[in-house]
């Protein structure tokens, strides 16, 4: 039975040209995390594998940095980066857990971080 929950940075906003850290955290399970995939809508951004380490998709290499931890740092943000991001935790023996983050990239300088929330 899957007992874990994913805590994410929730709905967040950031300024155009700036950077943002996307973070997810898996809790309430002793399952082993074997891999975390980061996706933006229908695009694979990056993968962190327990054995192989990080792979950043070549088309995002200039603007995506691994970490901190299992998180992902997006740099040189543009308005086109606005949208949903998913962290997909592959675990053993539980299976797959998915967390969602919504990022809004703002033109103005009034970008504030949203509250954290949990996805069961």
């Amino acid at each position: 039975m899957m007992t874990g929950t994913i805590e994410t940075t929730g709905n967040i906003s950031a300024e155009k040209g700036g950077s943002i850290i996307l973070q997810c955290h898996l809790s309430s399970t002793t399952a082993q995390v074997t891999q975390v995939n980061w996706e933006q809508q229908d695009q694979l951004l990056a993968i962190c594998n327990a054995d192989l380490g990080w792979h950043i998709s070549p088309s995002f290499k200039d603007r995506v940095a691994p970490g901190p931890g299992l998180g992902l740092t997006l740099q040189s943000l543009t308005v086109n980066d606005t949208g949903e991001y998913f962290c997909i935790y592959h675990t053993y023996p539980d299976g797959t857990y998915t967390g969602r983050i919504f990022l809004e990239v703002l033109e103005s300088s009034v970008a504030e971080h949203g509250a954290r929330f949990q996805i069961p």
């Epitope: 082993q32 074997t34 229908d42 694979l44 327990a50 054995d51 192989l52 088309s59 592959h90 053993y92």
Partner: antibody, heavy 118, light 107 residues
Framework: EVQLLESGGGLVQPGGSLRLSCAAS????????MSWVRQAPGKGLEWVAS????????SYADSVKGRFTISRDNSKNTLYLQMNSLRAEDTAVYYC???????????WGQGTLVTVSS | DIQMTQSPSSLSASVGDRVTITCRAS??????LNWYQQKPGKAPKLLIY???SLQSGVPSRFSGSGSGTDFTLTISSLQPEDFATYYC?????????FGGGTKVEIK
Amino acid sequence: EVQLLESGGGLVQPGGSLRLSCAASGFTFSSYAMSWVRQAPGKGLEWVASISSSTGTISYADSVKGRFTISRDNSKNTLYLQMNSLRAEDTAVYYCARVPYSVWMDYWGQGTLVTVSS
Amino acid sequence: DIQMTQSPSSLSASVGDRVTITCRASQSISSYLNWYQQKPGKAPKLLIYAASSLQSGVPSRFSGSGSGTDFTLTISSLQPEDFATYYCQQSYSTPLTFGGGTKVEIK
């Protein structure tokens, strides 16, 4: 240089068994998921089975479930496919492939031919 | 199971032609789509992974695009060594499935 070398193919009667081996070299075998893919004569590619790296998580195609067993020996850098209750429709070239991040198959062996016929 | 449908199943083209092969998934597979080239009697060779990433050592005339259910492999200027069969493959979920293949022949 990454190399995958399959062996163990041959002619076997229906209902018989074979064990295929895939000897890996040139990379840290234990860090990679691995798969078997087959190709019947004149046909397309068909995935057979996969095994993960660290946890040994296994999955099979429905067509071979209960008859084939994928396994690995990380100390020998070798992937195996035990094939039992073989049928004529299992006749194919069997390839082993390395699967980084369980997403793409970046290196393939040269294949070994399995022929099931009476 | 996710079905992968490739089109066309075969095509004739000349050296220098721009060639486009499409692959459609029966459900969304995000960008978990790979393209392989296979020549007679040889093992498949990875060309494109994760829909659009060019595998190391593969010529830049090969490119991939698409996400969700619709994907494309493009060869910008067909070379003599490109005459082969091309397969798409989804790795979104097991069972892993391949398209039926597209044979690129000399016109």
